[in-house]
Interface confidence: low
């Protein structure tokens, strides 16, 4: 069971100091930008953390969320990344949702964040360049200290 | 083309702060995709990493020297620079300043593509 | 830290000759390294990196290969201006760590 709490607006960067946002095709993607452009760009680089009560708590259960025409929220469904139009939900009668991450620091870098998926245990949102892109993939953490898999996050509140 | 020379005094005394400066033309420190590292090379050794700046401040430090080691870098000079605390005998080196090219998830790229011709920095009294 | 060995140490070859350099990892590093040239007074030269990707300008006569723990650096047909130092240089895991070298000296 989760249960809404209170929500934040932030900016997320990888370690690359590239910042994410959603393009008019709705991917999650990193781009480098300057304080500007992420201002320029805004909404599409400002996420609502909504923040979740955990009956069984494993670290702070949150969604992500982009409020462009409409909100849409990231969902890891079938492991694939996308934002699906819906609000965060008020209540989530479940241990496990493709919405739900438990967003943790990384030991020994408290400004450094990882957001592991409550469905697929040991996934996390990672930052992947196919092509010319640094797209936001869920990705099975394969090894100790891999950076693509470690984000900071701005409140902009 | 990137071009990168260092700077600084040849000679430190044991227990001073070692300072260099790698000034970079040809392009900037601050555009992002590449890390800005210091190595150096003990005479007739192999080489060691000593740790790289990100444009956006972070850094990143060889866990051997950790502590003792500072990286940090001037935009507006388009210059990064190294300072090392408490040095010994075993600091004596050929220290070289390089860029790295950033990486991303699978496409990780942690080579170091163009480097200072080196400064030889013996630690004496 | 990841540890890099090299072999041999130091290898002597003639122009014309076909040699290999190994280098081996304390673990397992992926495709995560690159191969390194350096000449007396000199900073090292980026030749091969992921294992096997020519860095832009290097000579076709260097290639790279492996994965895991075990990797090699052939040149296929020494030149004179080959003879030199070369290293290995591991990123998979931070610190980034370099084998020891081998220099290749003329026979």
């Known amino acids: 069971y989760f249960g809404k709490l209170e929500s934040k607006l932030s900016v997320i960067r990888n370690l690359n100091d590239q910042v994410l946002f959603i393009d008019q095709g709705n991917r999650p993607l990193f781009e480098d930008m300057t304080d500007s452009d992420c201002r320029d760009n805004a909404p599409r680089t400002i996420f609502i953390i909504s923040m979740y009560k955990d009956s069984q708590p494993r670290g702070m259960a949150v969604t992500i969320s982009v409020k462009c025409e409409k909100i849409s929220t990231l969902s890891c469904e079938n492991k694939i990344i996308s934002f699906k139009e819906m609000n965060p939900p008020d209540n989530i009668k479940d241990t496990k949702s493709d919405i739900i991450f438990f967003q943790r620091s990384v030991p020994g870098h408290d400004n450094k964040m990882q957001f592991e998926s409550s469905s697929y245990e040991g996934y996390f949102l990672a930052c992947e360049k196919e092509r010319d892109l640094f797209k936001l993939i869920l990705k099975k953490e394969d090894e100790l200290g891999d950076r693509s898999i470690m984000f900071t996050v701005q409140n902009e509140d | 083309q990137v071009q990168l020379q260092e700077s600084g005094p040849g000679l430190v005394k044991p227990s001073e702060t070692l300072s260099l400066t790698c000034t970079v033309s040809?392009?900037?420190?601050?555009?992002?995709?590449?890390?800005w590292s210091w190595i150096r090379q003990p005479p007739g050794k192999g080489l060691e990493w000593i740790g790289s700046l990100y444009y956006s401040g972070s850094t990143y430090y060889n866990p051997s020297l950790k502590g003792r080691v500072t990286i940090s870098g001037d935009t507006s000079k388009n210059q990064f620079s190294l300072k090392l605390s408490s040095v010994t005998a075993a600091d004596t080196a050929v220290y070289y300043c390089a860029r790295t090219p950033a990486y991303f998830g699978q496409d990780r790229t942690d080579f170091f593509d163009v480097w200072g011709r080196g400064t030889l920095v013996t630690v004496s009294s | 830290d990841i540890q890099m060995t090299q072999s041999p140490s130091t290898l002597s070859a003639s122009v014309g000759d076909r040699v290999t350099i190994t280098c081996r990892a304390s673990q397992g590093i992926s495709s995560w390294l690159a191969w390194y040239q350096q000449k007396p007074g000199k900073a090292p030269k980026v030749l091969i990196y992921?294992?096997?990707t020519l860095e832009s300008g290097v000579p076709s006569r260097f290639s790279g290969s492996g994965s895991g723990t075990e990797f090699t650096l052939t040149i296929s047909s020494l030149q004179p201006d080959d003879f030199a130092t070369y290293y290995c240089?591991?990123?998979?895991?931070?610190?980034?760590?370099f084998g020891q070298g081998t220099k290749l000296e003329i026979k």
């Open positions: 992921k294992a096997s």
């Open positions: 040809g392009g900037s420190i601050s555009a992002g995709g590449y890390y």
């Open positions: 240089q591991q990123s998979h895991h931070p610190p980034w760590t």
